[in-house]
């Protein structure tokens, strides 16, 4: 049903839903400071153009009493609870940032009449792409996909002369949130992966992963894993690895491989890791500092989320436009907007943009390198290093299947 | 241009206080986390303390933490820097300083502008 916003007569409202199932375990004291700090920014800017209008944020809590496993397994009801309450008290802003489960975000999208537009830090899977008034701040799998498959068809580059068509994936059902969809992603046979891969297979049990580190009659030399160094250690350990194995693990928010004295462990040898650029956001600062990385980055994203809303408000008061509009609430896509750390990019679909990276281990000075890097809006690869000192053969990558020759 | 200036400084007792303020001309004045720094005669000028954009962030150097605090109104284009219980190490001249993005920072190269600096003198 329609409910009516606070949002009109130079007074503008934020729901900020926050949920006991979450995409990270952040204590919801870390998000308020975040959106706190946001809002103050966004006042500043929106005084500074000479727009003299209020803003504030009304943090819409769940009461928890069904619905606690506190991870997004019992998320796609709290989100419609949560709604409801919002229905009840009439509290709708004119925006909704929230939802961050991909469960709660696709039953949110799909159960309410959306005519105000909703901003995630998370809902990573599939079924939340081509939203027309969804905007996700964290990338989501489609990203992801679109980057291996890309890097998988590269055969162009001195470090990468093979063109790959096969892989493994190790998904055992343990992930975080965000590793579970993108792995689910890659793992759906109809999904932009599956479909320019010739051979796929998923790896469920420990042993299987182990088992194909030095199977003769492997089908891929190419693993993809999701999670950070300790839970690929915890899988591998020190067991042997066949010399044409390369495992690519993706740890998107995770920016430690860049700090300074950080030393790759031996295991890390066979490994190439897929992580974000960390552009500005700066490992020592006060923000980050109480933060596990993910976690850094789900803040960050709720604050971005803030940063976006007072970008959007400020064009289209600038041009004498209504805010509680379907074109106020398609807007939230196409566009660059300044975020807490720059510039920040969403797509056609409202879906961030970003630089990704692919790292390698030095057996030289044992550090993390970028290989290349990766921009998702052009869906376009950059190589960096064009003589890493790999652990393969001749410094290149080798071939996806063992035993065949030049592609 | 952006510019810095700093103001309160002077001569004070041991255990005395002091409030240091830092006026700006960047505008909007939300989007800088601002910095304090201060220098020594024969040191390299050192972090003292930082605030984010919206004033929610803030960091300080051990050696003052507990006795300085930060804080910021953005709408007087402001960073202000109340130092209590002050020793004679902390004689030095202070320096405020816009960060190039709104987090909270305290490494120099983080930094883009800075003011001329006001002299603080702890006398025991």
């Known amino acids: 049903s329609q409910v009516s916003q606070n949002c009109h007569n130079g007074s503008y409202e934020i729901s900020v839903l926050m949920m006991g199932n979450s995409a990270f375990a952040e204590p919801l004291k870390n998000l308020e400071d975040a959106v706190n700090e946001g809002l103050e920014i966004v006042r500043g800017r929106l005084q500074n153009a000479g727009l003299n209008v209020t803003v504030n944020a009304t943090f819409m809590y769940s009461d928890g009493l069904i619905h606690n496993s506190g991870d997004c397994r019992s998320s796609t009801c709290e989100g419609l609870d949560l709604l409801r309450k919002i229905s009840n008290a009439q509290r709708m802003g004119c925006v909704l940032i929230g939802p961050s489960c991909t469960y709660s975000t696709f039953q949110m999208y799909l159960d309410t009449e959306l005519s105000y537009p909703m901003i995630s830090a998370g809902s990573f899977g599939l079924s939340c792409d081509y939203k027309e008034t969804l905007t996700r701040l964290m990338s989501p799998a489609r990203k992801l996909m679109y980057f291996l498959v890309n890097f998988w068809k590269t055969n162009d580059l001195p470090f990468k002369t093979y063109s790959w068509s096969t892989s493994y994936v190790y998904k055992n059902g343990t992930e975080t949130e965000d590793c579970f969809w993108y792995l689910n992603a890659l793992e759906a046979s109809v999904s932009y992966f599956s479909h320019e891969l010739g051979f796929k297979v998923v790896l469920r049990q420990d042993k299987e992963f182990q088992d194909i580190l030095m199977d003769h009659n492997r089908k891929s030399n190419v693993i993809i894993m999701c999670g950070g160094p300790e839970f690929l250690y915890k899988l591998k350990g020190d067991r042997a690895v066949a010399e044409d194995i390369v495992i690519i693990l993706v740890d998107l928010f995770n920016d430690q491989y860049f700090e300074d004295n950080v030393t790759a462990p031996d295991y890390m040898k066979n490994v190439l890791v897929l992580t974000l650029s960390p552009g500005n956001s700066l490992l020592n600062s006060s923000f980050s500092r109480n933060l596990s990385p993910t976690k850094r980055d789900f803040a960050l994203a709720y604050l971005n989320g803030i940063l976006l809303f007072g970008h959007m408000l400020k064009i289209f008061l600038e041009n004498g436009e209504n805010i509680t509009t379907p074109k106020f609430a398609h807007a939230f896509r196409n566009l660059t907007f300044e975020g807490y750390d720059g510039p920040v990019t969403l797509d056609d679909w409202g879906d961030v943009d970003s630089t990704m990276v692919l790292l390698y281990t030095s057996v030289d000075t044992k550090k993390y390198k970028v290989l290349l890097t990766y921009d998702t809006h052009v869906n376009k690869t950059y190589p960096v290093d064009m003589s890493p000192t790999f652990t393969w053969k001749n410094s290149k990558l080798p071939n996806d299947i063992t035993g065949r020759g030049p592609q | 241009q952006v510019q810095l200036v700093e103001s309160g400084g002077g001569l004070v007792q041991a255990g005395g206080s002091l409030r240091l303020s830092c006026t700006g001309s960047a505008r909007p004045f939300s989007n800088y986390g601002m910095g304090w720094f201060r220098q020594a005669p024969g040191k390299e000028r050192e972090f003292v303390a930082a605030?984010?954009?919206?004033?929610?962030?803030?960091d300080f150097a051990d050696a003052v933490k507990g006795r300085f605090t930060i804080s910021r109104d953005n709408a007087k284009n402001t960073v202000y820097l109340q130092m209590n219980s002050l020793k004679p190490e902390d004689t030095a001249v202070y320096y405020c300083?816009?960060?190039?993005?709104?987090?909270?920072?305290?490494?120099?190269?983080?930094?883009?502008?800075w003011g001329q600096g006001t002299q603080v003198t702890v006398s025991s």
């Open positions: 300083a816009r960060a190039r993005t709104a987090r909270v920072v305290s490494r120099r190269h983080e930094y883009d502008y």
């Open positions: 605030i984010s954009g919206g004033g929610v962030y803030t």
